[in-house]
């Protein structure tokens, strides 16, 4: 039975050209986390494998940094980065848990005056 829950940063906004941390946290389960996938729509951004560490997809190598922890840092943000991001926790024996984050990348002036979910 899957008892765990994923907590995420929810809906966040960030400034164009800046960076943002995507964070998820799995709680309420003793299941072993074997791998965490970070995906944008159907595109794989990065994977943190418990045995082998971080693998960053080649196409995102220059704009994605691992961490902190099992989180992911997106850098040099563009308006095209706006959208849904998913953290997918592969666990044993529970199975797969998925968390969702919506990121809105705003033009500089808009982000400065209207960002409601800005993460420093």
């Amino acid at each position: 039975m899957m008892t765990g829950t994923i907590e995420t940063t929810g809906n966040i906004s960030a400034e164009k050209g800046g960076s943002i941390i995507l964070q998820c946290h799995l709680s309420s389960t003793t299941a072993q986390v074997t791998q965490v996938n970070w995906e944008q729509q159907d595109q794989l951004l990065a994977i943190c494998n418990a045995d082998l560490g971080w693998h960053i997809s080649p196409s995102f190598k220059d704009r994605v940094a691992p961490g902190p922890g099992l989180g992911l840092t997106l850098q040099s943000l563009t308006v095209n980065d706006t959208g849904e991001y998913f953290c997918i926790y592969h666990t044993y024996p529970d199975g797969t848990y998925t968390g969702r984050i919506f990121l809105e990348v705003l033009e500089s002036s808009v982000a400065e005056h209207g960002a409601r979910f800005q993460i420093p």
Partner: antibody, heavy 128, light 107 residues
Amino acid sequence: EVQLVESGGGLVQPGGSLRLSCAASGFTFSDHYMDWVRQAPGKGLEWVGRTRNKANSYTTEYAASVKGRFTISRDDSKNSLYLQMNSLKTEDTAVYYCARGQYYYGSSSRGYYYMDVWGQGTTVTVSS
Amino acid sequence: EIVLTQSPGTLSLSPGERATLSCRASQSVRSSYLAWYQQKPGQAPRLLIYGASSRATGIPDRFSGSGSGTDFTLTISRLEPEDFAVYYCQQVGPPLTFGGGTKVEIK
């Protein structure tokens, strides 16, 4: 051409130290994990340890038999891998190979790891 | 630590024959973490198979790998003179470990 060339082997007394080098060329060194593997005379292959890549903060892992005595490091600016061997024992006598670790994902949930490029090896003899 | 046991230790066969090499793990191994290497005297190992069944670049199709869980097999469908060598299986771990090797020698 993708190539690894080891150097630094030689004869050393028990308790002594030696530093092996591995020069890499023909690929983006900083992207790759790098492993050291050794082979004692007439024996099989034994993994010594590994350094991960830049994305993984160059973290290192070691076999139990060398932990605390051997240190793996790298210099991406020189495309070079190193193995510092201290407190050497006679059982460390072997040919030492450096190898490129290939860590990638064929799909979102299948991580592959293997050593696809090997150096020619350098011989370390520990004897009094 | 996962122990890989290879059998037989030595396989005596003639060119043209089929070779079947076994690698058994002390506990379950992800198939994508299992690789096979060939080593000839005085040479470095060479990658043959990765992910239990995928041939490395430039490896002839007479080499094939199969298996999952704790039992893996390397098959050489028709032995060529250059195939007589020692073969090692390897898993990622941690820690990474090799099997003890199987020597394929000319009968």
